[in-house]
């Protein structure tokens, strides 16, 4: 006879699954805040910085109340993939000024990657429909100058900070409904 059957697969507790995702998100939020503050100290920002290639912010007035778990996770995953790509780009093409933010930028990239894996796992455990594979994104053009790289860093970290706040708020709100 073959090996004895393994223990029956316990269906995951969605609240516990969400909890560990929220924990990772909050942790990444704190890292991002710290890194953004470090960037502001070294290269003070004047006003808001935007980058056209970044995802538009996920939340608008009233939208949080209507959130559903599949939509939040799918949107969050897509946005974080974009931010991961931007952080990788920043590390590669951001110029010598941004080297002063290492190894923190590398740590941020690794934690972002970990959160994305966690989201993927959560979606499969909750049997949510898996999004189709992402189409290859057009390559990001290198910054036109050292200052362009710094402005891009402000935009990327600022946008990621707000996206993670949206994620924590949305996920905790959804948890109260489970």
């Amino acid at each position: 006879p073959g090996p004895p059957p393994g223990p029956p697969r316990v269906s995951p507790d969605p609240r516990a699954e969400l909890d560990s995702t929220v924990l990772l998100t909050r942790s990444l939020l704190a890292d991002t805040r710290q890194l953004a503050a470090q960037l502001r100290d070294k290269f003070p920002a004047d006003g808001d910085h935007n980058l056209d290639s970044l995802p538009t912010l996920a939340m608008s007035a009233g939208a949080l109340g209507a959130l559903q778990l599949p939509g939040v996770l799918t949107r969050l995953r897509a946005d974080l993939l974009s931010y991961l790509r931007h952080v990788q780009w920043l590390r590669r093409a951001g110029g010598s000024s941004l080297k002063t933010l290492e190894p923190e930028l590398g740590t941020l990239q690794a934690r972002l990657d970990r959160l994305l894996r966690r989201l993927q796992l959560l979606m499969s455990r909750l049997a949510l429909p898996q999004p189709p594979p992402d189409p290859p994104a057009p390559p990001l053009a290198p910054p036109s100058s050292a200052w362009g790289g710094i402005r891009a860093a402000h935009a990327i970290l600022g946008g990621l900070h707000l996206t993670l706040d949206w994620a924590v708020r949305g996920l905790l709100l959804l948890k109260t409904r489970l």
Partner: antibody, heavy 119, light 111 residues
Framework: EVQLVQSGAEVKKPGASVKISCKAS????????MDWVKQAPGQRLEWIGD????????IYNQKFTGRATLTVDKSASTAYMELSSLRSEDTAVYYC????????????WGQGTTVTVSS | DIVLTQSPASLALSPGERATLSCRAS??????????IHWYQQKPGQAPRLLIY???NLDSGVPARFSGSGSGTDFTLTISSLEEEDFATYYC?????????FGQGTKLEIK
């Protein structure tokens, strides 16, 4: 100096609505959430909800959903809380407070606005 | 919702003494190195003031005689040597889940 300055005391009749303002200064308004907290006489502090000024999305304590409405005017660095269908148990001091993104601790508070609901 | 219970309800001490205030949560508010508990001080007619965030971090401008500790469900605010201006009501608050909730407070009075 980082400051939150709230509008003055209000006396309202049951069934009416009240709208309180909270003007922020001394920091970048969109870098923090704005939270609202109720303190009724002899009761513990109660979180009403919060709003992210950058994106404008409020979330509410279920207890206040449907009666509290949180809004912001980014250009004026001002947050608002409107409470409708007032009843006597809404008599309280209402505070706005600056909330750390994603962590809900409140490091700067307004001076409070007293709302009295009485017929 | 998570319920926070503070003890004692009131405490009478003299300046120079050590004060130990307790806050117990109805379920754990800690997770992987983070404890989502915060402490505030409130004086009559004033707004609350943040003292400690995430269980043990002193907010800027708060004297070093204040400290926070604990994890899981049991947390403590300690004032190592009481000054006149420390006599007030102290609240704990959690932010582990939504909604954040507050304890009922501990009133610290002069003996």
């Amino acid at each position: 100096e980082v400051q939150l300055v709230q509008s003055g005391a209000e006396v309202k009749k049951p069934g009416a609505s009240v709208k309180i303002s909270c003007k922020a200064s001394g920091y970048t308004f969109t870098d923090y959430n704005m939270d609202w907290v109720k303190q009724a006489p002899g009761q513990r502090l109660e979180w009403i909800g919060d709003i992210n000024p950058h994106q404008g999305g409020p979330i509410y304590n279920q207890k206040f959903t449907g009666r509290a409405t949180l809004t912001v005017d980014k250009s004026a660095s001002t947050a608002y809380m409107e409470l409708s269908s007032l009843r006597s148990e809404d008599t309280a001091v209402y505070y706005c407070a600056r909330g750390e993104l994603g962590h809900w601790y409140f490091d700067v508070w307004g001076q409070g606005t007293t709302v009295t609901v009485s017929s | 919702d998570i319920v926070l219970t503070q003890s004692p309800a009131s405490l009478a001490l003299s300046p120079g003494e050590r004060a130990t205030l307790s806050c117990r949560a109805s379920k754990s508010v800690s997770t992987s190195g983070y404890s989502y508990i915060h402490w505030y001080q409130q004086k009559p007619g004033q707004a609350p003031r943040l003292l400690i965030y995430l269980a043990s971090n002193l907010d800027s401008g708060v004297p070093a005689r204040f400290s926070g500790s604990g994890s899981g469900t049991d947390f403590t605010l300690t004032i190592s040597s009481l000054e006149e201006e420390d006599f007030a009501t102290y609240y704990c608050q959690h932010s582990r889940d939504l909604p954040p909730t507050f304890g009922q407070g501990t009133k610290l009075e002069i003996k």
